[in-house]
């Protein structure tokens, strides 16, 4: 008889899972010098111990202690750059300025990046067929409790001058519902960090306007000035250049706006 | 400059009580997991106690029952209060913070020793 199984609304794990985050580790640690001591096979066991068993609506970040410690990684407080509904942009851009770091350039990103995962109560089973989707099932599910936890603790982390990349493009260019909105700008600590600077990444080839005037844009400085940091904003007006500009900032076409 | 600065070790008599305190400067102690961590001559360094940012904790068997952390963000102050000592913790007691971007910080540590 085969075994009843709770159908979630969401896709199920990414197929290979296991071995996906095991070799990512690897390769991770085989790039990265400084966590070259990092052991991937405790690190998956941790990965697998914060979701395996649990009902996949009743994770904690308390589950995934045991893999935050093991994922330590200083990343330098003032090099990081946030993103909100533009990742690859955000990505392209630590890929060339390699001296700033997104969430998935850290070792944990990095493991996580684009997958799902879930477990099942009370079985040691992953569950490949569906996972609980954030709307329609349960917010407390593995993979957003996952990011919840590391984004926060990667916001926590930042000081000086921390760089948010935001799409321009969006109707909410900022949106207090995603992760940026709702867990890193509440976890900035206002006695380490100075400022906040916005990038709006904008879309259209003839689209000059200043998107710093968005409302939601004014929003997010009203949040970010009522914890008592600093906010500027820089519209991006030609993404491609601003790449180009970044990989070649000594081009003649780099000293006016981009 | 991050320093932690562990204070109140000392000599004390099997079943008695000490209080341990670690001092944070230099970070914001909210942000950390905190834990205290022992080593006795010629063994490893282990796990006392720990107390996560969100103000879980936990404690290795030996001392469950005897040995209490706790933390206060507003002095960045964590303590671990020993009661019913025996000769077996006797050691070298450090303070350990903790974030999984932020960096790992140890204390000097402080001396414990528990003898008749």
């Known amino acids: 008889v085969p075994r009843w199984r709770q159908q979630w609304s969401g896709p199920g794990t990414t197929k290979r899972f296991p071995e996906t985050v095991l070799a990512r580790c690897v390769k991770y640690t085989e790039i990265h010098p400084e966590m070259r001591h990092v052991d991937c096979q405790s690190v998956w066991d941790a990965f697998k111990g914060a979701f395996i068993s649990k009902h996949p609506c009743n994770i904690t970040e308390e589950d995934y202690q045991p893999l935050m410690k093991l994922g330590t990684q200083t990343v330098p407080c003032n090099k990081i750059l946030l993103w909100s509904r533009i990742k690859d942009l955000a990505h392209q851009f630590t890929q060339v300025q390699r001296d700033m770091f997104t969430l998935e350039d850290t070792l944990l990103g990095y493991l996580a990046d684009d997958l799902t995962w879930c477990g099942e109560f009370n079985t040691s089973k992953i569950n490949y067929q569906s996972c609980p989707d954030w709307r329609k099932d349960c917010s407390n599910n593995p993979v957003s409790v996952f990011w919840k936890t590391v984004s926060r603790r990667f916001a926590e982390a930042a000081c000086d001058v921390v760089h948010v990349m935001l799409n321009g493009s969006r109707s909410k260019i900022f949106d207090k519902n995603s992760t940026f909105g709702s867990v890193e700008v509440h976890n900035l600590q206002p006695e380490k960090v100075q400022t906040l600077e916005a990038w709006v990444i904008h879309g259209g080839r003839e689209d000059s306007r200043d998107l710093c005037q968005d409302p939601t844009i004014k929003e997010l400085e009203s949040i970010i000035s009522k914890r008592n940091i600093q906010f500027s904003c820089k519209n991006i007006y030609r993404p491609d250049k601003f790449l180009q500009c970044v990989k070649n900032p000594e081009d003649s076409s780099c000293t006016s706006e981009i | 400059q991050v320093q932690l600065q562990e204070s109140g070790g000392g000599l004390v008599q099997p079943g008695g009580s000490l209080r341990l305190s670690c001092a944070a400067s230099g970070i914001i102690l909210r942000i950390y997991d905190m834990g205290w961590y022992r080593q006795a001559p010629g063994k490893q360094r282990e796990l006392v106690a720990a107390?996560?940012?969100?103000?879980?904790?936990n404690y290795a068997d030996s001392v469950k029952g005897r040995f209490t952390i706790s933390r206060d963000n507003a002095e960045n102050t964590v303590s671990l209060q020993m009661n019913s000592l025996k000769s077996g913790d006797t050691a070298v007691y450090y303070c350990n913070a903790d974030h999984t971007f932020a960096g790992v910080y140890w204390g000097q540590g402080t001396q414990v020793t528990v003898s008749s």
């Open positions: 107390i996560t940012s969100g103000g879980r904790t």
